[in-house]
Structures are given as C-alpha cells and as structure tokens.
C-alpha cells in the first residue's frame, strides 16, 4: 500500500509502484512537508533517525536536460543497521529519501537477500508531495517473526534507469535454540555401540547440548552443538533425547526409544487358502520381528500318517508376501504343516501346526496290459486290461474312459465310451469294416481323467474273413503294439 | 491555476508533417512529466509516451516510436508533438497530460485536446 | 501489456440511480488504477486516483473500489451532468493502458 499526504496532510491509501496488493494500516503521515519554492536538502526530512545522507548508493543520473542541467544526486537517509528481537515479536523498520520532482517518475521495491519481495502485503509506501520535493517512506512490517525472516533487507528505487540502493538493514530473530538435527530411534544388537547425533541453532550463539538417558542426564558438562553420544551398549530398551540451551533457554528434542533386537515371535494364524491334488496354498501372520527386519521364512510339512517314516520336507521363501504354495505333495494326503521365519538374530520358533489335505488327483498312470480282439460271430471288439496301481491312481477309481478310433480310406472317426469301476473289460461294436481301430484306455477319478495307455490297433477286414488274434499291449520294455491276424 | 493550453486543430495531407504545442501554467514545468494521449475518432485512449521536462529525455510506447517525437521549450513552459509523414491513421485528437508526481503515473491535469485532420 | 477490460460498452441509467462501472486487469495492477470521466469534445477530468481516492473537487457520489485485477466506479444518484464515457486506467507498469470505456446513458 501506499500513503500519498498533500499540504493538508490527509493520508490517503495508495499503491506502491513495486507491490501488488494492500494491507491498510495505520496511514498517519510521519512528516507533512511544509510548503518549499525551492529545492530543499534531504536532511529537512528524516523519519528514522537524524543523519547525513550517505553516499555509498549515490545515484547520479548520466542523462541532462536540453540545457544540460545535471540532476543532483540522490541518496537514501541512513537507518537503523541492524534489529535484534525475539521469536514472535513484530518489527516495523523503513528507509527513506527524498526525490526533487524534476526526476518525475520513480518506483521503489523491498529486497531481501538479493531477491525481491514481489506481493509483499506487509509493506507500506507513505509519499508526501511538494512543489520541489516529493519526501518518500517505504516501511516494512512483519507482525510476528520467525526465523526465516532472517536477512539482509534494502530498499532500491529505479530512476531514470539508474537504480539507488539502501543501506542494507540486518534483521536477526533470537529465540530458543532450534534443532535442524533430532536423535532418531534405533533398533541395535545388544552389547553392541551406537551414535546419536544432536544439533540446534540459535540465534543466540552458542547452543549447549545435554544428553538424557531415561530422565537422566548422560554428561556432567554441556557440548557444543553439534554433538555426537556414543553408547558403549545396552542390554535392555533405553529413552534418549537432548536438551539445547542457549542465553534464551532451553529446547527438548523427542524422545527417541532405542531397541535391543532379539529373535522374532513365530507367526500366528497359519491358515490354508487353497489345496489341489499336489499343492496346498498357506499364508500367515508374522509375528513380532524383534526390532529387526524379517529375512526369510521356512515352511515346514511332514505327512500325518501315522504310518508315515515322519519326514520333514523344508521349503524356504522370502519373507513377504506371508504366503507360499507348497508343491510336490501326493494326493488325498494329510499333512502337518508349521511356519518359522528368521531375522539378523536367528529363527522363530515354529507356529502353531495346522493340518491340511490335498485333495483327489487324476490317476498318474494307465491301465496296464490293454488286450484287444475280434469277436467276428458278434461284430465286436473285445477289450480287457489290468488296473493301475493303488497308490498311483491319486484317489478312488470311478471307471475307465474307452478311446476307439476308425480308420478307413482316409476317413477317420473317434468314439469314446465310459465304462465303471468294477470292470476290467468291455466290448464295442464295429463301427466300420475293413478299417484300422485304435484302442486308448485311462483310468478316472472324481480328480480327473489319467493318461491314456499306448494304442493298440487291430485290422477289422470285410465280412466273410475268418479267425483272427487278439492284439495286445506289449509288456514293459516290448516294441511298439503290433496288429496280429 | 494549473492550466495546459493546447494549439489549435490542424488539417494536413498525408506525408506532411505536424506540430503540436501544450503550454503548461501555474506551476513549476520541470517539475511534472508530460504524457500525450491519442484519442481516434470514436476511439478509446491510447498513451503515446512522455517526456521528462527537466532532462528532456523521452519515452515512446512501442506503437509510436519512428515518426512521433517529443521536445520541449522549457522557457515557455511547452511541450510538443511532432508527427512526420502524416497518414490517415494519424487523424485524431491528441491530448498532453500532466503527470501527477515523482512516485505516481495518473494523470492529474489535461490538455483541452488538438484535432489533426488528414485528408489529401 | 496490461489490459483493461470495461466489459459494458454502454450502460444505461436514470437520474437518482446507483450505477457500477467495472473494469478488469489482465493481471495483477495493485490498487495503480485511476477513472476517468470525458465528455464529447471535452479532455478527460480525473476523478478517481489509486483506485479509491478522490481527486480534489469530484463529487462524493463517485466512489472507486477494488485492488489486484477487479475494479469498480459506482456513482450513487445519477445526476443529468453525469452522463458521459467512463474510463479506467491502470499505472502499475509501462506502457500505462486505457481501458476501452463505458457509456453511461438515460434509459
């Protein structure tokens, strides 16, 4: 804002040429200029204090008049060089000059280190017009200080392209010591050293640091800041903070709680989220790490049967995500199954166990000795096998699916029957004559169908042909199936 | 009384030149910037620049720099505009103003105005 | 460059009325605005300076508000002598810019 004061001295809220915005304040002019027929010298108007103008920032502009008339020289009046005050307070400080009006066009603006204050609204021009003199205060404001308030503060006006500058003003905010640098909390091995860091700023210097350990004080003598404790070891949790003393008091830093890492707690709620035939999805809940970060997490599993040599199939995956697929298991088996993970220390105990079961599988094998004849009196096709092992048919048969494929003159046909689970035989009729058939068999369970058995084919010729021999899956290690007629 | 006296209207013909005074009174003339104003038939304002009086330095906004200058007389207490080759765009009225202080860019104090006619 | 924009061309009024005149900067003027009254064949007379203050001997029925880019004339009870073009003028920065003016007519 800007105060304009004529002869009456009537202020008037103004704009100042540099600073956008206003801020009404108090706009009592500090001088009303007497009326002057001549030019008058700087000294008849000093607001801040009595002083000669000085004449490190004289401004003594190149450019003259037609008559070459040089413009006098211009300067701002000294002021206050530097203000001390506390956090908080408000401070008001200004600079002020007086401008002959045959410079005619003039603006004024705030910097502070070196930057401009753009859109200050705490600052206030008061400008007082005579015939001769226009006299001009540019005040500044802060209401409440804080520390980045700190700096080197001028004033600059810009005339006829020629730049005048304050003296500059040092405005330094003193309050209780500041801490750019806190202990931090830390999880550390028992016994073992460790270093806290603890550093505050004035203004006022110096800043003394006290260290505490648990509400009590670590050093009889106080250390500059910055300072570094070194702690031979801790065999239990302790509290650290420091205290920051400076001619204006005293600062605490937080509080920092240093950890003594131990091995974690096992993990809780092991739980199964998903089973198939050979796999079993588990996740868990970890438990409390120790103060030091989780490594890896080992699975253990051993079969549940109490038949079983009792085992332990181990399986070791990353901590995270708390969850893992244990593959490789059989079929329709009960497992036990516990958690344990590990951190910088060592092992968790094992969880809690859980039981879990996979669930029926498809038989891992085919039916064995596939057999496969002509009945020509009936016009079938005979077939028989044995079936697959116990053990391998990863869960209860349910039957048997039957693959026959015809071929004939390049047309090809597949047909496929069920048959259940009692039998080891069954019989298909002919479906074309003088045609190659193709036997598969696989034997199913409620987990799916199994793999089918190596073909076994048989020549059915046209009718009226006589006596033909069965054809047979060969026994393990034999050659290919062959058609025998 | 503070007074700007404007010369009269001017007819002229493309490429010619003009001159126009504003004489100012009733206060100290080195004392106050002198700004002029064009105003086109119809038109708004638009500032052409000023003139320190005391240095006699110049300002020309962008739209009037080559063919528009300013000069003074200070013991008369004038100001002139000068327009050189002249063309119909050029007619208006033009206006001195009187700049209201060191620190202020308003204009506090008007000329009457000058009509320049072109016309071939 | 700054601009001025006087949004109504024309504005029309009767004696006694309350009339508002506004005008917007293209960016941020302060409170470095002026109103300028100006009636045909006659200068413009000043009437408002930084924005709000009156210039000595204008009625006290012209008042000037605003700051930053939005501004506005209002002249309580319109007299006769009133009617005329309007014109605001920002002096924050050079080139010092016109807006394109407002006439205030009888309805």
């Known amino acids: 804002a800007i105060t304009e004061a004529r002869e009456e001295a009537k202020p008037y809220p103004l704009f100042p040429g540099p600073f956008p915005g206003s801020l009404q304040t108090d706009h009592t002019p500090l001088l009303s200029l007497p009326h002057a027929s001549g030019y008058q010298p700087a000294l008849m108007f000093s607001p801040t204090q009595p002083g000669r103008p000085h004449t490190g920032n004289v401004a003594i502009p190149q450019v003259t008049s037609v008559e070459s008339k040089p413009l006098p020289p211009l300067a701002f009046k000294h002021t206050v060089g530097h203000i001390i005050l506390s956090e908080h307070k408000g401070v008001k400080f200004n600079c002020s000059i007086s401008v002959p009006n045959i410079y005619q066009d003039t603006t004024i603006s705030w910097w502070k280190d070196g930057k401009e204050l753009l859109g200050a609204h705490h600052a206030i021009t008061q400008f007082y017009p005579d015939d001769e003199v226009t006299a001009i205060i540019a005040s500044f404001s802060i209401t409440s200080v804080q520390r980045s308030d700190n700096g080197s503060y001028i004033c600059k006006m810009k005339i006829n392209n020629e730049e005048i500058v304050s003296d500059p003003i040092y405005i330094e905010v003193q309050g209780l010591p500041h801490f750019t640098k806190q202990p931090e909390s830390m999880n550390v091995t028992r016994n073992t050293a460790f270093n806290l860091t603890c550093q505050a700023v004035g203004p006022p210097e110096p800043v003394n640091i006290f260290w505490v350990q648990n509400s009590s004080r670590v050093n009889e003598q106080p250390e500059k800041s910055p300072s570094v404790l070194t702690v031979p070891g801790l065999t239990e949790m302790a509290v650290f903070s420091c205290e920051a003393h400076n001619d204006k008091g005293l600062t605490v830093s937080k509080g920092v709680q240093i950890n003594i890492k131990a091995i974690p707690s096992p993990p809780t709620e092991v739980s199964i989220r998903n089973s198939t035939a050979h796999s079993i999805l588990i996740s868990w809940v970890p438990g409390f790490d120790g103060y030091s970060p989780f490594r890896n997490c080992s699975i253990q599993v051993k079969e549940a049967d109490p038949l079983s040599n009792g085992s332990v199939m181990i399986f070791n995956t990353s901590a995270l995500p708390h969850l893992y697929q244990i593959k490789q298991l059989q079929a329709l088996a009960n497992y036990s199954i516990g958690v344990s993970c590990m951190n910088e220390i060592g092992w968790s105990a094992v969880s809690p166990w859980i039981l879990a079961s996979t669930t029926e599988g498809a038989p891992s094998v085919a039916p064995l000795n596939v057999t496969v004849f002509l009945n020509e009196s009936s016009d079938n096709v005979d077939i028989r096998w044995m079936k697959p092992p116990t053990k391998q048919q990863d869960g209860e048969l349910v039957g048997y699916r039957i693959s026959h494929v015809w071929q004939s003159a390049g047309i090809s046909k597949e047909l496929l029957e069920e048959v259940g689970q009692n039998g080891s035989r069954a019989r298909i009729s002919v479906q074309v004559h003088n045609a190659t058939c193709t036997v598969r068999i696989a034997a199913v369970t409620r987990g799916g169908v199994g793999p089918f058995s190596d073909p076994v084919k048989i020549f059915i010729p046209a009718h009226g042909w006589v006596d033909y021999a069965p054809s047979s899956t060969p026994a393990p290690g034999n050659a290919d199936p062959v058609l025998i007629i | 009384q503070i007074q700007l006296v404007q010369s009269g209207p001017e007819l002229k013909k493309p490429g010619e030149t003009v001159k126009i005074s504003c004489k100012a009174s009733?206060?100290?003339?080195?004392?106050?910037?002198m700004n002029w104003v064009k105003q086109a038939p119809g038109k708004g304002l638009k500032w052409m620049g000023w003139?320190?009086?005391?240095?006699?330095?110049?300002t020309y906004a962008d739209d009037f720099k080559g063919r528009f200058v300013f000069s003074l007389e200070t013991s008369a207490s004038t100001a002139y505009l000068q327009i050189n080759n002249l063309k119909n765009e050029d007619m208006a009225t033009y206006f001195c103003a009187r700049k209201s202080t060191v620190v202020s860019r308003y204009f506090d104090v008007w000329g009457a105005g000058t009509t320049v006619t072109v016309s071939s | 460059d700054i601009v001025l924009t006087q949004s109504h061309k024309f504005m029309s009024t009767s004696v006694g009325d309350r009339v508002s005149i506004t005008c917007k900067a293209s960016?941020?003027?302060?409170?470095?605005v002026t109103w300028c009254q100006q009636k045909p064949g006659q200068p413009p007379k000043l009437l408002i300076y930084w924005a709000s203050t009156r210039h000595t001997g204008v009625p006290d029925r012209f008042t000037g508000s605003g700051s930053g880019t939005d501004f506005t004339l209002t002249i309580n009870n319109v007299q006769s002598e009133d009617l005329a073009d309007y014109f605001c003028q920002q002096y924050r920065s050079y080139p010092l810019t016109f807006g394109a003016g407002t006439k205030l007519e009888l309805k």
């Open positions: 960016q941020d003027v302060g409170d470095a």
């Open positions: 009733g206060y100290t003339f080195t004392n106050y910037g």
């Open positions: 003139i320190n009086t005391y240095t006699g330095e110049p």
